[in-house]
């Protein structure tokens, strides 16, 4: 899934490192590779044997504000007859990404980096069977 | 830009949009998530569209290690454990944000960078094109 685009102009890059106060980091949120394309196969979320739906989460105090999460449609997997086979499991595949969180404390504003775990899709796996003695 | 709700009692000088450059706290929230997919699950081996994980390492990026998935087969593994070419293993790709040291090699100055990673593979019914 692609990250929504935010309009930014690009500034001249300074030659030397900018001064940064101790305990903090300077972050430019003008995204490098903003315009690269996702070339995923067509409709794989519907064609998969472990199909999934997408939900968009929106938070105006997060950058990017829009994060797309996938949810597996079934517990089992779809067989050749188009029926759910519960002897197999649809499981989520997850990936970490970074976001910037904006925090309001009274009238002051601070920024925090945050790791977000995104579910990107689902895959069909053979279940792990635990045998009870 | 992104509109931010403002505290109504605060001075009106605050920009509604996210500024182009921000100073961020050195701590990262939610930092206890496991970054090594080999350690966090064995789905890459148990999947009907299994994949191998390749380590992509760059000391001038955060995180410095990103794992890239490559599907092992063109087809999918059937109930007998054989590759079924009537189905296709395809990568699931995701755009993620990482930090790039900018200006280059500056220790505590960064810019967001968007990179495309293959996170895993899924088994799909192929699109069949019929020739007239």
């Amino acid at each position: 899934r692609k990250i929504p685009k935010v309009g930014h102009t690009f500034f001249q890059k300074p030659e030397s490192c900018p001064p940064v106060p101790g305990g903090s980091m300077k972050l430019d949120i003008g995204i490098i590779n903003e315009n690269q394309r996702v070339s995923m196969s067509r409709n794989i979320e519907s064609r998969s044997t472990s199909p999934w739906n997408y939900t968009v989460t929106w938070d105006p105090n997060r950058y990017p504000s829009e994060v797309v999460q996938a949810q597996c449609r079934n517990l089992g997997c779809i067989n050749a007859q188009g029926k759910e086979d519960i002897s197999m499991n649809s499981v989520p595949i997850q990936q970490e990404t970074l976001v910037v969180r904006r925090k309001h404390q009274g009238c002051s504003v601070s920024f925090q980096l945050e790791k977000v775990l995104v579910t990107v899709g689902c895959t069909c796996v053979t279940p792990v069977i635990h045998h009870v003695q | 830009g992104i509109t931010i709700p403002r505290n109504p009692g605060c001075p009106n000088s605050e920009d509604k949009n996210f500024p182009r450059t921000v100073m961020v706290n050195l701590n990262i929230h939610n930092r206890n998530t496991n970054t090594n997919p080999k350690r966090s699950s064995d789905y890459y081996n148990r999947s009907t569209s299994p994949w191998n994980l390749h380590r992509n390492e760059d000391p001038e990026r955060y995180p410095s290690v990103i794992w890239e998935a490559k599907c092992r087969h063109l087809g999918c593994i059937n109930a007998d454990g054989n590759v079924d070419y009537h189905m296709n293993s395809v990568p699931i790709q995701q755009e993620i944000l990482v930090l790039r040291r900018e200006p280059p090699h500056c220790p505590n100055s960064f810019r967001l960078e968007k990179i495309l990673v293959s996170v895993g593979c899924t088994c799909v019914t192929p699109i069949v094109h019929h020739v007239a």
Epitope: M25 | R31, R55, P59, S64, L99, P107
Partner: nanobody
Framework: EVQLVESGGGLVQAGGSLSLSCAAS????????MRWHRQAPGKQREFLAS???????NYADSVKGRFTISRDNAKNTVYLQMNSLKPEDTAVYYC???????????WGLGTQVTVSS
């Protein structure tokens, strides 16, 4: 907090070699990237080399081919082997480290390297 202690600095003649080492201690949860920078009097701190936990390295053009960065993950130690030293390599050499949990760079106090002509 991560503490870093550099050692191995000193006075050397032009064309000579020197090996610096830097040990990380404290709450060394997991050191990710280790790096060397230097600062000459009246100048900005300059990047020299960095090395990730898997051994991937990055060098500044000014030291490529002369300096070699290496590390011992078990000892949380990074090394800088400096060959064919020049008077312009005279500076305080700083070791830096980034934890796996975040990109912030922690610094050592530095070790003086003086190259005489």
């Amino acid at each position: 907090e991560v503490q870093l202690v550099e050692s191995g600095g000193g006075l050397v003649q032009a064309g000579g070699s020197l090996s610096l080492s830097c040990a990380a201690s404290g709450s060394v949860f997991r050191i990710d990237v280790m790096r060397w920078h230097r600062q000459a009097p009246g100048k900005q701190r300059e990047f020299l080399a960095s090395i990730a936990s898997g051994g991937t390295t990055n060098y500044a053009d000014s030291v490529k081919g002369r300096f070699t960065i290496s590390r011992d993950n078990a000892k949380n130690t990074v090394y800088l082997q400096m060959n064919s030293l020049k008077p312009e390599d005279t500076a305080v050499y700083y070791c830096g480290a980034n934890a796996e949990s975040g990109p912030y760079t922690y610094w050592g106090l530095g070790t003086q390297v003086t190259v005489s002509s």
